[in-house]
């Protein structure tokens, strides 16, 4: 029940971390103009990875995606990879999982093939809360040295768009955003490897032995984890060895229409 | 075709009170920021107040901060302005105008007057 | 606050004239984020509101004359009437679309001789 809980929590804890990444992606406020020196300004400018938009005090946003793959820094290229692998493998990640859920049964997969696939899963979302974290550091690390180099342009050549001295740009909401969802993904990847740990087969040499005692008929199968092929089999993960006898709760399994999808 | 038309305007003492109404007709009232502009007889425009389209920002000139409070009524297309604690040189025409793309006041109303003197 | 400075006080002109007018900024009105300079034009007639003629420094106002165009850089625009006629007697006001509190200029009057 355990095991079965902490897949099921590392599931929707990387979901939502995934969805996160991909709101942080598409956001447009990943840097924020700095309204210390003037709060309150009548125009106020914030950048995506993206877009640039502009919001004036009078309520008109007007917003120019950048139309350049060549004049953009390097940095923010390499933090929109980060953030597109970063989803690519969490999407990945979410499909392998949704098929490695204890819950769901798909023909007679064994144990050992779900655990393999929540491994799987759980490292792809680790490696993709890493890319969202590194993707959203390495923009905030950029932020900083613009910020204290007014005189340097952080998107010099992005489609006319120079920055002046007057306007700083500070973390922007998509950051906090990237760095929560990044975080929640990888978390959610820790705990599914850790659920694939209880879900791994402990394989152990017994021979099957059948025999009729006297007023019902046991059967016994060999290995550690029962194996079992229906949708109301032994949920409570319990073991069989010879010589043990079957307990009241659980229920022969037989092949049912479910089985063969 | 759009109208603002300012009212409420009149002779006041110094120290006194009074409110100022600007009805708008001809457009979405409640999609613009609406400003008060003043301009002192013989003089030049100065701004006054600022309220958003949801009354959620708010702005006031230094020189009437504290004293006037502007506000709005989306249902009723109406724009107020109170004012409290006039002095003199509150004597102006006061302007009500609509906010629009560019930052810029492209409609104004006619203007009501206020006078403050003893 | 952003001052802004407009020269000359008044102008003498003669009809079909080409006039032009100055406004200086204490502080750059170009907003990096979409490169417009947020500086706008108004004319008062005697008796009237103001009236919108040019916003972002050189957008025209629909239905205002092409005759009336907007320049300039960060800091110093400029207003000019090609061609000056009777109806455009008026105080031309520039204004700070920048930053608050909004500012405007003392004017420009414009005179026929």
């Known amino acids: 029940m355990a095991v079965t809980a902490c897949q099921g929590l590392g599931f929707v804890v990387s979901l939502i971390g995934i969805a996160g990444i991909i709101a942080a992606t598409c956001m447009d406020q990943w840097s924020t103009q700095d309204l210390y020196n003037n709060p309150v300004t009548a125009v106020f400018n914030y950048q995506g990875l993206w877009r640039s938009c502009v919001r004036e005090s009078s309520g008109f946003t007007e917003c120019r995606g950048y139309f350049t793959l060549l004049g953009l820094p390097a940095m923010l290229q390499a933090v929109r990879a980060l953030m597109i692998v970063g989803i690519v493998l969490g999407a990945i990640g979410l499909l392998v999982s949704i098929f490695a859920l204890k819950c769901i049964r798909i023909g007679s997969m064994e144990d050992s093939a779900k655990a393999n696939m929540t491994l799987t899963s759980g490292i792809m979302f680790i490696v993709s809360g890493l890319c969202a974290i590194a993707g959203v550091s390495v923009f905030a690390n950029m932020l900083v040295t613009n910020f204290w180099m007014s005189t340097a342009n952080m998107y010099t050549g992005m489609g006319g768009m120079v920055q002046t001295v007057q306007t700083r740009y500070t973390f922007g909401a998509a950051l906090f955003v990237g760095w929560v969802a990044g975080g929640l993904t990888l978390i959610g990847g820790v705990m599914m490897c850790i659920a694939c740990r209880g879900l791994a087969p402990e394989e152990t040499n017994y021979k099957a032995v059948s025999y009729h005692a006297s007023g019902h008929s046991v059967a016994y199968k060999p290995g550690g984890f029962k194996a079992s092929t229906g949708f109301g089999s032994n949920t409570k993960n319990k073991k069989i060895y010879d010589g043990g006898a079957r307990t009241e709760d659980e229920v022969q399994s037989y092949p049912s229409k479910h089985d063969y999808v | 075709e759009v109208q603002l038309v300012e009212s409420g305007g009149g002779l006041v003492k110094p120290g006194g009170s009074l409110k100022l109404s600007c009805a708008a007709s001809?457009?979405?009232?409640?999609?613009?920021?609406i400003h008060w502009v003043r301009q002192a007889p013989e003089k030049g425009l100065e701004w006054v107040a600022y309220?958003?389209?949801?009354?959620?920002?708010?702005y006031y000139a230094d020189t009437v901060k504290g004293r006037f409070t502007i506000s709005r009524d989306n249902a009723k297309n109406t724009l107020f302005l109170q004012m409290t604690s006039l002095r003199s040189e509150d004597t102006a025409i006061y302007y009500c105008?609509?906010?629009?793309?560019?930052?810029?006041?492209?409609?104004w109303g006619q203007g009501t007057t206020l006078t403050v003197s003893s | 606050d952003i001052v802004l400075t407009q020269s000359p006080s008044s102008l003498t002109v003669t009809a079909g004239e080409k006039v032009t007018m100055s406004c200086k900024s204490s502080?750059?009105?170009?907003?990096?984020?979409?490169?417009?300079?947020?500086l706008t034009w108004y004319q008062q007639k005697v008796g009237q509101p103001p009236k919108l003629l040019i916003y972002?420094?050189?957008i025209r106002e629909c239905g205002v004359p092409d005759r009336f165009t907007g320049s300039g850089s960060g800091t110093d625009f400029i207003l000019t009437i090609s061609s000056v006629q009777a109806e455009d007697l008026a105080v031309y006001y520039c204004?700070?679309?920048?930053?608050?509190?909004?500012?405007f200029g003392a004017g420009t009057k414009l005179e026929l001789k």
């Open positions: 204004q700070n679309a920048y930053s608050y509190p909004l500012t």
């Open positions: 001809g457009f979405t009232f409640s999609d613009y920021g």
């Open positions: 309220i958003s389209s949801g009354s959620s920002t708010i």
């Open positions: 972002w420094a050189s």
């Open positions: 502080q750059s009105l170009l907003n990096s984020g979409n490169q417009k300079k947020y």
């Open positions: 105008a609509k906010w629009d793309r560019g930052n810029c006041f492209d409609y």
